[in-house]
Interface confidence: low
Amino acid sequence: EAHKSEIAHRYNDLGEQHFKGLVLIAFSQYLQKCSYDEHAKLVQEVTDFAKTCVADESAANCDKSLHTLFGDKLCAIPNLRENYGELADCCTKQEPERNECFLQHKDDNPSLPPFERPEAEAMCTSFKENPTTFMGHYLHEVARRHPYFYAPELLYYAEQYNEILTQCCAEADKESCLTPKLDGVKEKALVSSVRQRMKCSSMQKFGERAFKAWAVARLSQTFPNADFAEITKLATDLTKVNKECCHGDLLECADDRAELAKYMCENQATISSKLQTCCDKPLLKKAHCLSEVEHDTMPADLPAIAADFVEDQEVCKNYAEAKDVFLGTFLYEYSRRHPDYSVSLLLRLAKKYEATLEKCCAEANPPACYGTVLAEFQPLVEEPKNLVKTNCDLYEKLGEYGFQNAILVRYTQKAPQVSTPTLVEAARNLGRVGTKCCTLPEDQRLPCVEDYLSAILNRVCLLHEKTPVSEHVTKCCSGSLVERRPCFSALTVDETYVPKEFKAETFTFHSDICTLPEKEKQIKKQTALAELVKHKPKATAEQLKTVMDDFAQFLDTCCKAADKDTCFSTEGPNLVTRCKDALA
């Protein structure tokens, strides 16, 4: 139904707390350099205005669209051009072009310092002093670093953060209570960020149809007892929610997500037997819980997929009659039978099935032509299964850090032109797949591994788009989203690359490395490893291991030395010489 005042409608639906949080996220995602105080001031102004519209929907400007209202606020910021350069040109445009312009200027890799967590005592003091401001800072800092973070889900993580602080700040040993819990939230939030970015990429590059196909596959796996009409309805609603969030329409997105959660809980009988626990929770927890609910038990009497999609004499007629519905039902039927496959794999199979029908239905004897299609799926299924086995075996042998290093070597050889910080970030993220997925039961490994890798590689593609340097990466990133991971996996050593000359300063370290946290130490060592591979792209695993072991020994020795500086300055050059010799 149409509302006289959109802003009043959303304020009433969402309530003041969520309304303010979402507006803060929206502004922080659009203008990523502004301080918290600048954004907090705008949020308060927007909220005060919304309240006047709630009181009187006919008041001045209350009938304006949210894009108009928010865009006008952003464009009124002083020194916009000085701080944001050409983004200020967006303000010369009219809606909807102005909002599109803002979206295009979102920066996936803003030059902001890492989000440092204050020490426990200081955190608890500022949290107790003003919990609202404290959580506002959290929303602002995460949103500006992750401009496509799923806004209602960020509110959920802020709520988690709040609960952890409330609990731990009351304890004697705040540090040991906070650290593991906040690390857990951070890890989950970072995974949520790359997953959502992948969804927005799908929407931006390939449109709603592509996202809806992803949703049909995912929902069919989770709710195998829901019929096709139900899955289609849920996929349509989920597509709308994600389109809104990816498009910066965060109030509408959060409101529609709440509606979808309400619908699912009211229609559990037709969707899944596993929803009740989620439905008993309050809104943010409920929606989060539903998004990762366990798969329902598969119906026991599902007929073989071949009956309707291969053996039926009417396949081509049915396909021609309504292509999208026919392919949608194929994807639904295949996905509900295969919770053990990744969504990416299911979409590749559906694509293969579509291509087969396109080819075969134009031939003289279609059934003879498409009769072998299910057998032709086999290599497509085997490839990711082998990938999972090989990589999980390697992870179990090397542990997370060693596994990250193996991936770093592999990817530096595939794309040595990519900047070392990007390669290190990608390898560290890709390497976490081991800890995240390889410990799961066998039937959950493949979907976990492949869908996670796809999301991480999407980030690699986004960063590479800004400054394209590798033809290998460009080739893999230009194709469809579901083909990216197999494309990257198939890449070999880039033979066109001219090795980097050896620079001693790249491998020169100082005593300050000794006091760094373990994670930072690892990053320093991995940076050196990537540089070694760029210098010698065809170095063997043994050569690289020799050098890295020597390097680790050098750090250990010098960091334990009485005079660390002298040790680094005298032993460092010897290490460099040994490295050069080992790689000669």
């Epitope: 096709f228 009497d301 007929p303 009956a307 309707d308 007629k317 049915n318 519905v325 039902t329």
Partner: nanobody
Framework: EVQLVESGGGLVQPGGSLRLSCAAS????????MSWVRQAPGKGPEWVSA????????RYAESVKGRFTISRDNAKKTLYLQMNNLKPEDTAMYYC????????GSQGTQVTVSS
């Protein structure tokens, strides 16, 4: 848009008969197996019967075997359920569904068996 519209329900005495119909539109009816599902007041949905896309393979729940017959007319895009020797425990809302699931995505038709 996928639509399933059931009809033919009503009030009948024990031992009586009814024939339910389900008119399908918005998808290629002849490509899909179909089912009948029912839901009694205060109970979860219960799968009743299923038929494959061509109409050759039919399945029934133990509770209705020998009394109910499922059939389809692909030309008319219609699914049927012939119910004979009805019992009070057959009282429920009846739904047709795509595939072989216990979910319902339509309005259903009420069947009441009572003396």
């Amino acid at each position: 848009e996928v639509q399933l519209v059931e009809s033919g329900g009503g009030l009948v005495q024990p031992g009586g008969s009814l024939r339910l119909s389900c008119a399908a539109s918005g998808f290629t009816f002849g490509s899909f197996g179909m089912s009948w599902v029912r839901q009694a007041p205060g109970k979860g949905p219960e799968w009743v019967s299923a038929i494959d896309s061509g109409g050759a393979d039919t399945r029934y729940a133990e509770s209705v075997k020998g009394r109910f017959t499922i059939s389809r007319d692909n030309a008319k895009k219609t699914l049927y359920l012939q119910m004979n020797n009805l019992k009070p425990e057959d009282t429920a809302m009846y739904y047709c569904t795509i595939g072989r699931s216990t979910s319902r995505g339509s309005q259903g038709t009420q069947v009441t068996v009572s003396s």
